[in-house]
Interface confidence: low
């Protein structure tokens, strides 16, 4: 049986729309149905429809079609809102440009190529001729438009209403032709529709015959209408998924624009001699990266092979050897000519309006007076004025309003981590600044003078719910997919976020993450009824060398018999040494038949004098660093536990101590784990999720 | 230089692991790839264990074949080897951690998979 | 999954002469190729990589040109030892491929020397 192909793919999609017809004749047909891809596959075919289909609606509240014989440019109708209603137009008779050889074209075009009124079709004079429309349904015959019924090679015609001229061509343009883009087309939002190679695109809000996290309610601003060619991913030009299963994407053949300027929304502020913001705007001459190591040619495929080449990024500027932000990186970066050494940032570039009065800071920077305004990504300070109210939310006592002036960095919260401010972008409402203590200063961060030991936990018990224990209590423990396999281990410490470590993102690319909750095999077999897939959302960095991330989750995650949270423990803690603990993760477990489950490995806490002697003298400690025992040879934390946590218990509490992260071998035996020491960066969580907004459920 | 080993004749359905040791460079800055070649037969690329120790599969060898590594070795598991399975096999170090270029490639271990 | 197909499989030339070996793309792989030469009975040898670029101790003779989806080698004033299959490989990663990854060799073209 051959198998129905899906139409909707030909319809323009104008949402909360509808049509009203002012002219009475006008003829409508309607039937309850399920679906808008019903409507489609109906209007196409014209099936049991008394006339041409050239559009319909689709009432999503009674589930109905309204199929018509015009659409919103013809005459006697209007368009008119309609939260219900959704209307989709057959693009063929919208459409003022020719598609190959024309064959599907149904426009209103009605003169030939040298200027001849064209001959209706259902008349013969002045020439007489088989085209008759009852003899070539489907290819729209109507009136005296320009058509290519038998898709001939000159592209539609017409017979012409001159005696002389039996038939002509018509100037019809090619719709490639028509469209056309600037720079690699990211802000492209034309209507071409198919590949370079002729194949129709698939609508982005749909799964088929291509699954994909391309989706329209997911990226608003990306203009994934109907199944139009776009460029969400910085490309070197539009693109689209095709309809065809065996192609899952292709190019659009859309040339670039005559006058190749941009839009003014796009146009970053260009700089040359410092960076604004992110700087990709940045159009000046360095080109070293920050420890002085030449950049690679961006034109050169040596020592490192790349596809951020000029004719790619036509507008970015991608000239000899200079320090640029073609993707949206953090800042300007570049390839380097060092063989070992494929990218690095060029930090050296100094911020504009970054005036270095005092450029370092005495113990966590609370006493900082320095007229610094910048955050270490780039972005300006805002007012401290403006964000009072915020700072009373997370602070319990009056600010020092005197040292609080202009958007200067300050620390009036005393984060243990130095200098800070509020930014103007809703995204990231504050961020550190590029501050650091100075040499020589050893003033503790850590100041607990009226406790010289607090406890980590919390006096709360262990959370169960609904009075039975989570799955062997594991709720928390989080699987970090990297286009769709598990990479790294994470802790869900509240609904919509997730602690893990920095080394487990090697793609900046959002889109190549998830997070999978709630399962116990690594591959979610069996987990069916209790896996939550999200999405990551927006990565956090921890403070400069924590090597943690807060990974937001595009939705809070749903917590229920399988997914729960885990505890953080009181900021500044100790905990007891030989306290037992336990480390988690899906990584490499040493054994040849790895069937997928999580494994637990017992450690117990070691005092960090101790830690360093069993690594022989090599490694010292320092406060942000816990270190944790295997009480069997080889086993511990290994490739794949990464990002995953140090659980300990300290009064019947379960909390997360550490977080794993690489650089510290493979459970050697004898050798002690160094953990990131959570409570060390406890007070910069908190803040965090106070601070940042996160989705409601 | 990377060599292989563990090559020999097996039984099919007699699981198999073959070894790629590395000498002069970290696996903590290379990727490692698995190549195989059947006799007069062309190159085909078996998968990838990245420096994060994530592995990615040829389609055709996903759950067929599994690629592990500590901090000299990698290894290419086959636990289910059939007749089609007989080939030389080589490691080979990519250019750096991710998607490149075979550098380095070891000889060769041949693996016959015969009842 | 991209396909990597490789005209011809077998050519034969005179020592001296000049072999063009052709490598197509099924999609665009920008200049992520390179080319290997493999002798019976011994491992495969990088020649080219980045299309273009000749690996360490590589003669001049041999030059891989092209980008996006048509690549070539050409081996000029061939020698006897040039005798060899020679492999082109595909190294780019698309993140809109399919998760599944592909086979990135070309089936291979053997040069026989005369």
């Known amino acids: 049986q051959r198998k129905r192909r899906n139409t909707i793919h030909e319809f323009k999609k104008s949402a909360k729309t509808t049509l009203i017809k002012i002219d009475p004749a006008l003829k409508i047909k309607t039937k309850k149905v399920n679906t808008a891809d019903q409507c489609a596959n109906r209007c196409t075919r014209n099936k049991g429809l008394p006339f041409t289909c050239k559009a319909f609606v689709f009432d999503k509240a009674r589930k109905q079609c309204l199929w018509f014989p015009f659409n919103s440019m013809s005459s006697g109708v209007k368009k008119e809102f309609g939260h219900e209603f959704d209307l989709y137009e057959n693009k063929d008779y919208i459409r003022n440009c020719i598609i190959g050889k024309g064959r599907s074209y149904k426009g209103t075009v009605s003169i030939t190529k040298s200027g001849i009124k064209c001959q209706p079709w259902s008349s013969m004079i002045p020439h007489e001729h088989s085209f008759l429309p009852s003899s070539y349904r489907g290819k729209d015959l109507q009136e005296n438009y320009c058509r290519n019924p038998r898709g001939e090679e000159g592209g539609p015609w017409c017979f012409t209403s001159n005696p002389e001229v039996r038939y002509e061509v018509c100037d019809i343009p090619q719709c490639s032709e028509v469209e056309c883009m600037t720079c690699n087309g990211e802000s492209y939002r034309g209507l071409m529709d198919h590949t370079e190679s002729g194949k129709i695109c698939q609508r982005w809000d749909h799964q088929t015959p291509h699954r994909h996290k391309f989706l329209p309610e997911r990226y608003p601003d990306k203009g994934f209408d109907d199944n139009y060619c776009r460029n969400p991913d910085g490309q070197p030009r539009p693109w689209c998924y095709t309809l065809d299963p065996h192609t899952r994407w292709e190019y659009c053949a859309i040339k670039t624009c005559a006058d190749n300027t941009m839009n003014d929304t796009d146009v970053p502020l260009e700089t040359t001699e410092c960076i604004q913001g992110q700087g990709e705007g940045y159009r000046g001459t360095v080109n070293t990266i920050w420890n002085g190591i030449p950049c690679q040619r961006w034109d050169s495929q040596y020592p490192h092979e790349h596809d951020m080449t000029p004719e790619n990024f036509k507008c970015k500027d991608l000239r000899e050897n200079y320090c640029r932000n073609p993707d949206g990186s953090e800042s300007p970066w570049c390839f380097t000519t060092d063989p070992n050494i494929r990218v690095g940032y060029c930090s050296q570039i100094p911020n504009c309006d970054m005036s270095h009065g005092q450029d370092c800071y005495r113990g966590n920077g609370k006493n900082y007076m320095g007229n610094l305004s910048q955050t270490r990504s780039g972005l300006t300070c805002s007012m401290w004025d403006k964000n009072m109210e915020d700072l009373h939310r997370h602070i319990f006592w009056e600010p020092d309003a005197s040292k609080l002036n202009e958007n200067y960095c300050r620390n009036p919260d005393d984060d243990a981590h130095g200098p800070w401010c509020y930014t103007g972008n809703p995204l990231i409402p504050w961020d550190y600044c590029p501050i650091s203590r100075c040499e020589g200063d050893t003033t503790p961060t850590i100041v607990n003078l009226d406790h010289p030991v607090i406890s980590c936990a919390k006096t709360k018990q262990l959370r169960v719910v609904n009075g039975i224990p989570t799955r062997t209590n594991i709720g928390w423990m989080v699987s970090l997919r990297y286009r769709n396999k598990h990479i790294c281990g994470g802790s869900l410490i509240k609904e919509s976020w997730v602690l893990t470590a920095r080394q487990c993102f090697p793609s900046r690319d959002l889109k190549d993450y998830e997070a999978w909750l709630g399962i116990h095999d690594v591959h979610g077999r069996g987990d069916e009824k209790c896996k939550q897939v999200l999405n990551v959302s927006q990565l956090v960095y921890g403070p400069e060398g924590s090597d943690l991330v807060l990974m937001k989750l595009a939705r809070p995650a749903v917590l229920d018999d399988f997914v729960s949270t885990i505890d953080l423990p009181n900021y500044g803690c100790t905990i007891p040494e030989k306290t037992s603990c336990s480390v988690y993760g899906w990584g490499y477990t040493g054994l040849i038949n790895y069937d997928g489950l999580l494994r637990v490995a017992h450690l117990y806490i070691m005092g960090n004098e101790k830690c360093s002697q069993h690594h022989r003298g090599k490694v010292t400690l320092n406060e942000s660093e816990i270190c944790a025992g295997a009480e069997k040879i080889g086993s511990g934390p290994c490739e794949g536990d990464y990002g995953g946590p140090l659980v300990c218990e300290q009064h019947k509490m379960r909390m997360v101590l550490g977080v794993i992260v690489p650089g510290r071998g493979c459970a050697i035996p004898n050798r002690p784990g160094i953990f990131v020491r959570v409570a060390y960066y406890a007070k910069w969580i908190h803040k965090i999720i106070l601070t940042y907004k996160v989705p409601q459920s | 230089s990377v060599e292989e080993s563990g090559g020999r004749l097996v039984m099919p359905g007699t699981p198999l692991t073959l070894t790629c040791t590395v000498s002069?460079?970290?696996?903590?800055?290379?990727?490692i790839s698995w190549v195989r070649q059947a006799p007069e037969k062309g190159l085909e690329w078996i998968g990838v264990?990245?420096?994060?120790?994530v592995t990615d599969y040829a389609s055709w060898a996903q759950g067929r074949f599994t690629i592990s590594k500590t901090s000299t070795t990698v290894d290419l598991k086959i636990p289910s080897p059939t007749t089609e399975d007989t080939a030389t096999y080589f490691c080979a170090r990519v250019y750096d951690s991710g998607w490149n270029h075979f550098n380095l490639w070891g000889p060769g271990t041949l693996v016959t998979v015969s009842s | 999954d991209i396909v990597m197909t490789q005209t011809p499989s077998s050519v034969e030339a005179a020592v001296g002469g000049t072999v063009t070996i052709k490598c197509q793309a099924s999609?665009?792989?920008?200049?992520?190729l390179a080319w290997y030469q493999q002798k019976p009975g011994q491992r495969p040898k990088l020649l080219i990589y980045?299309?273009?670029t000749l690996a360490s101790g590589v003669p001049s003779r041999f030059k891989g040109s092209g980008s996006g989806t048509q690549f070539t080698l050409t081996i000029s004033d061939l020698e006897c030892a040039d005798a060899a299959t020679y492999y082109c490989q595909n190294y780019y990663y698309s993140s809109r491929s399919s998760y599944d990854t592909y086979n990135v060799f070309g089936g291979g073209t053997e040069v026989v020397v005369k």
């Open positions: 999609e665009n792989i920008y200049r992520l």
């Open positions: 980045s299309a273009s």
């Open positions: 002069g460079f970290s696996l903590s800055s290379n990727a």
């Open positions: 264990i990245y420096v994060i120790g």
